[in-house]
Interface confidence: medium
């Protein structure tokens, strides 16, 4: 019997406190050789799976779940787990995503409630729109 799989880690870029309408990328990391990552909300009733896994370093693989335009509905506790060679890992610690207006002048656009997740990438100039960034990657309706 093999030993337990290492626990994954979870983080958010650029951070865990995001103004409404801004993008955020939740990053799940695990060992090399992960076949699939899952990002879950706290109650496990909502999740998103991706097989779009990249090698972050010689010892780590990662998946990046992007939300193009966060709203209050995206706030909450997230955690990751992964599949490697048909085995599921333990869960990561919880990440608490906070959706919070900036201080001082309100500095985020009014946004639509829908969003999407998937591998983050630098958008082309043609897709840039500060009000409604172009959707990228996987549909996230089950998770977000």
């Amino acid at each position: 019997q093999e030993g337990p799989l290492p626990r994954p880690s979870i983080s958010a870029e650029p951070g865990t406190v995001i103004p409404p309408g801004r993008p955020v990328t939740i990053v799940c990391r695990g060992p090399v050789g992960v076949d699939q990552f899952r990002l879950e909300r706290e109650d496990r009733s909502k999740f998103n799976d991706t097989k779009d896994v990249s090698q972050a370093s010689p010892s780590e693989s990662e998946a990046r779940f992007r939300i193009d335009s966060v709203s209050e509905g995206n706030a909450g506790h997230y955690r990751c787990l992964y599949v490697k060679s048909t085995r599921w890992s333990e869960h990561s610690d919880y990440l608490d995503l906070v959706v919070k207006e900036t201080s001082g002048d309100t500095d985020s656009p009014v946004t639509e409630p829908d969003s999407s997740a998937g591998p983050t990438q630098r958008p082309s100039d043609n897709s840039h729109n500060e009000h409604a960034p172009a959707s990228q990657g996987l549909s996230a309706e089950h998770l977000y």
Epitope: E13, G15, P23, T102, G104, D107, P109, D125, H128, E130
Partner: antibody, heavy 121, light 107 residues
Framework: EVQLVESGGGLVQPKGSLKLSCAAS????????IHWVRQAPGKGLEWVAR??????????YYADSVKDRFTISRDDSQSMVFLQMNNLKTEDTAMYYC????????????WGQGTSVTVSS | DIQMTQSPASLSASVGETVTITCRAS??????LTWYQQKQGKSPQVLVY???TLEDGVPSRFSGSESGTQYSLKINSLQPEDFGSYYC?????????FGSGTKLEIK
């Protein structure tokens, strides 16, 4: 190629007015926020003003040092941004840069070469 | 308003050395920080955004880090083209203030 070209700088007396222009090209202008940043001779960078896109009703923001004196505006049909500067003070003497904001990555990613404003009697 | 306190104001170093420039925010800016490089007589250019992410084309000897409200730009193995001025800027809330700058000079 993304380009921002400023014009309109020059010598003006205290309490005078000046209007700076910025001509943008090489990107989808109407979806980007644009900023003005200035730099006094031998000094650091100072954020001056910002105007956002039509989708945010052209929201504007100003540094306290220029509020009620400067007005930022834009003309999407001409891909132009303007900075109307009134009641100028000697401390407004600076190089004024027109800059594009990359909203995805929270950076001022393309800068013009600047236009020089001198306020002196 | 958030204030950015940058240090040192000037720094003298030799080619090959490692230097670190810091900016301290007066409040929590949640990694919404960009670092710029400006050469004499030129416009600034982005080096690092979101506190830690290297802009495309920027050499890997540059790196950004964060600890609480303190943000650092580290330059490993200084090259002749690295000399100039460096500025931080926060993007958490308007006004998007800059740090006062650090002039990096050749020793």
């Amino acid at each position: 190629e993304v380009q921002l070209v400023e014009s309109g700088g020059g010598l003006v007396q205290p309490k005078g007015s000046l209007k700076l222009s910025c001509a943008a090209s090489g990107f989808t202008f109407n979806t980007y926020a644009i900023h003005w940043v200035r730099q006094a001779p031998g000094k650091g960078l100072e954020w001056v003003a910002r105007i956002r896109s039509k989708s945010t009703n052209y929201a504007t923001y100003y540094a306290d040092s220029v509020k009620d004196r400067f007005t930022i505006s834009r003309d999407d049909s001409q891909s132009m941004v303007f900075l109307q500067m009134n009641n100028l003070k000697t401390e407004d003497t600076a190089m004024y840069y027109c800059v594009r904001e990359n909203w995805y990555y929270y950076a001022l990613d393309y800068w013009g070469q600047g236009t020089s404003v001198t306020v002196s009697s | 308003d958030i204030q950015m306190t940058q240090s040192p104001a000037s720094l003298s170093a030799s080619v090959g050395e490692t230097v670190t420039i810091t900016c301290r925010a007066s409040g929590n800016i949640h990694n919404y920080l960009t670092w710029y490089q400006q050469k004499q007589g030129k416009s600034p250019q982005v080096l690092v955004y979101n506190a830690k992410t290297l802009e495309d084309g920027v050499p890997s000897r540059f790196s950004g880090s964060e600890s609480g409200t303190q943000y650092s730009l580290k330059i490993n193995s200084l090259q002749p083209e690295d000399f100039g001025s460096y500025y931080c800027q926060h993007f958490w809330s308007t006004p998007f203030t800059f740090g006062s700058g650090t002039k990096l000079e050749i020793k």
